[in-house]
């Protein structure tokens, strides 16, 4: 499903290519902004975001941000241009097809972020790189 408030033009006229010359088409990403989450102490979680969006620009990638403080845990899912910082951090892993979470230094909270470039790749956020996607027992996340 593509929600109208985030669905943007799929621009076939202004061609954007990657470093190999392949056309970069607008990507499909989970796009729920910030939601409360119970994803904690797991190797992997599903976003449980029901909104799949076509990103506004072909160069945008999927991003997920997991934050934990004394009060709650949140998961943010968006599209974002990797040329621009997000939450003051560069998206170093934007070319990855999977969303491998990396911890970032943020005072007062635990902060993980990942970015990736395959359709809806921020639906499955991976905290352990050796995680095997075929194990369904690791895919539990409930939103409040």
């Amino acid at each position: 499903t593509i929600p109208p408030h985030v669905q943007k033009s799929v621009n076939n006229d202004m061609i954007v290519t990657d470093n190999n010359g392949a056309v970069k088409f607008p990507q499909l990403c989970k796009f729920c902004d910030v939601r409360f989450s119970t994803c904690d102490n797991q190797k992997s979680c599903m976003s449980n975001c029901s909104i799949t969006s076509i990103c506004e620009k072909p160069q945008e990638v999927c991003v997920a941000v997991w934050r934990k403080n004394d009060e709650n845990i949140t998961l943010e899912t968006v599209c974002h241009d990797p040329k621009l910082p997000y939450h003051d951090f560069i998206l170093e892993d934007a070319a990855s097809p999977k969303c491998i979470m990396k911890e970032k230094k943020k005072p007062g909270e635990t902060f993980f972020m990942c970015s990736c470039s395959s359709d809806e790749c921020n639906d499955n956020i991976i905290f352990s790189e050796e995680y095997n996607t075929s194990n369904p027992d690791l895919l539990l996340v409930i939103f409040q």
């Epitope: 499903t1 593509i2 929600p3 109208p4 669905q7 799929v10 076939n12 990657d18 392949a22 056309v23 970069k24 088409f25 607008p26 990507q27 499909l28 076509i54 097809p97 999977k98 470039s117 395959s118 359709d119 809806e120 790749c121 639906d123 499955n124 996607t133 075929s134």
Partner: antibody, heavy 116, light 107 residues
Amino acid sequence: QVQLVESGGGLVEPGGSLRLSCAASGFTFSNAWMSWVRQAPGKGLEWVGRIKTTYSGGATDFAAPVKGRFTISRDDSKNTLYLQMNSLKTEDTAVYYCTLDLRDYWGQGTLVTVSS
Amino acid sequence: DIQMTQSPSSLSASVGDRVTITCRASQSISSYLNWYQQKPGKAPKLLIYAASSLQSGVPSRFSGSGSGTDFTLTISSLQPEDFATYYCQQSYSTPPTFGQGTKVEIK
């Protein structure tokens, strides 16, 4: 330039099988959800099914009329999408289009005729 | 599945005419509605997405409106290249279903 080229269409008898292929180029195929849409002669468009990326498990969805008879697969190493059609019926006669799911890229279509 | 019903199924019009095609969904689909144009022997081309947003490269004489269950595609001044078949499609839920099409013919 994005290119989607379907092949494998032809004449088949009712109850028979056929496998369509879609060769993709010009984009990172492995990163994309892909769909099949069909159009019976002189009729409208009908979504057949989709396959998600291998990275997310390669899950598939199908329209009710083809569920259990058609399967969709992909070979990311060959940049190729497949539609395996079994137990074909005369009402499956159509031009089958390969599409980049939910985006405006379509192949030229390949005609499948189911007839005795 | 959500059923999409277009009307009329065909219409005859002249160059310069204002043309309106309607699409009704069997249940509310918010604004998750796309319009396609198809010419004989060709693949469909996306014109309007999210009910009212114009796809890049599509002439501004095409416009879309509506939300919920009732939607409209309008061609403000029909041009020779606009004679084609038009389809609505909902992208609210899987399967993403199409209307049966509206053929716009030369009067």
